[in-house]
Amino acid sequence: DLKVEMMAGGTQITPLNDNVTIFCNIFYSQPLNITSMGITWFWKSLTFDKEVKVFEFFGDHQEAFRPGAIVSPWRLKSGDASLRLPGIQLEEAGEYRCEVVVTPLKAQGTVQLEVVASPASRLLLDQVGMKENEDKYMCESSGFYPEAINITWEKQTQKFPHPIEISEDVITGPTIKNMDGTFNVTSCLKLNSSQEDPGTVYQCVVRHASLHTPLRSNFTLTAARHSLSETEKTDNFS
């Protein structure tokens, strides 16, 4: 009996430019003889429904149809037919199929590969054209993929134990696509600093599929209106 197992859940997520290993494990009732077996990896793009050969291994012959693609013959002996793709790009996302032949048996498995890019975030103060005691803070998130992103603003006063999400005076612009396929977006918070308590911490919070925890940039209102603190990237309310 020949069986192939891919990543549990059927999806693998990898960061842009990473050296990704797409898992494929072979289970066979007898010890594997790699000289009499074949492995072929196929890729189907998200955008068009055509399967392309990425890599093949047959006996003493192996060929990479995608530069740098490799299956380790040494690991193959112990049933690991995982495909390594160095420097993965956004356009290489899609369905990967691992096909194993141990004559006369054949088995296959598929996995979806998602390529993500993490946003970079920075906080800017724009006082141009603003009234006295009024400030506009801009939170720029750039270089992220996929397009779906959630940007919120939070504030925490000195006295209360938890932050609160700000919903008024927040405008988040449209996402803009970059030449490399990643996206940028800017969210703006308008503040009347005369109505806020000194010591209040404001924070731009970015949530994205590529991030395990949200990305935060903060500033603290001081008696002298505001300070975009040096620690604006310390991800910290304290």
Epitope: K159, H162, I164, R216, F237, S238
Partner: antibody, heavy 117, light 107 residues
């Protein structure tokens, strides 16, 4: 990292007073407001009051007004909560707490005060 | 003072179950609600703030929802370590007030 270390357990007689301390470390002490909570055995949580750590502002729960006093010693980064005219129903674990960061608010380990004759 | 009425006071469930705890405020508190988990002999630990935002390092199986007067904490798939007590708290105004707690027990 931020740490709030409280004084040890106390046993008091009814009518006496107790003073619980909370020593803070790992952050700029005076920039914060410190709250005090208590929890009677097997019961829920109750806010007692709070103090701004620069020492110029307090806010007490009406229920405890006249019996509770919160003070600060900035030289040792320590906050104190004193409760007077103790009665058996004041038997509880007392906690100092500070507003948090993105992992949540900070709590001391708690101080058990037992009021018993 | 704002009263926070939490229900149920106790709840029996099994590992893997989905459970919901509710909290009702006596007046509009917007989204100024937090949820805590407290294990026996330990200080409470924050899970949720602003009604629906998870604190970092809190597992994604915990989620909060609601605004105004009605709030819920949902645990999507109970793990053995989740069987303990949960409290809601309003922080729109002083005095800060808590719900009476919900004790989650293994069925």
């Amino acid at each position: 990292q931020v740490q709030l270390v409280q004084s040890g357990a106390e046993v008091k007689k009814p009518g006496a007073s107790v003073k619980v301390s909370c020593k803070a470390s790992g952050y700029t002490f005076t920039n914060y407001w410190m709250n005090w909570m208590r929890q009677a055995p097997g019961q829920g949580l109750e806010w007692m009051g709070g103090i701004y750590l620069s020492g110029d502002s307090t806010d007490y729960n009406e229920k405890f007004k006249g019996r509770v006093t919160m003070t600060v010693d900035t030289s040792t980064s320590t906050v104190y909560m004193e409760l007077s005219s103790l009665r058996s129903e004041d038997t509880a674990v007392y906690y100092c707490t500070r507003r948090g960061d993105y992992f949540g608010d900070f709590w001391g380990q708690g101080t058990l005060v037992t009021v018993s004759s | 003072d704002i009263q926070m009425t939490q229900s149920p006071s106790s709840l029996s469930a099994s590992v893997g179950d989905r459970v919901t705890i509710t909290c009702k405020a006596s007046q509009n508190v917007g989204k100024y609600v937090a949820w805590y988990q407290q294990k026996p002999g330990k200080a409470p630990k924050s899970l949720i703030y602003s009604a629906s935002n998870r604190y970092d390092a809190v597992p994604s199986r915990f989620s909060g929802s609601g605004s105004g007067t009605d709030f819920t904490l949902t645990i999507s798939s109970l793990q053995p370590e989740d069987f303990t007590t949960y409290y809601c708290q309003q922080y729109i105004s002083y005095p800060l007030t808590f719900g009476a707690g919900t004790k989650l027990e293994i069925k």
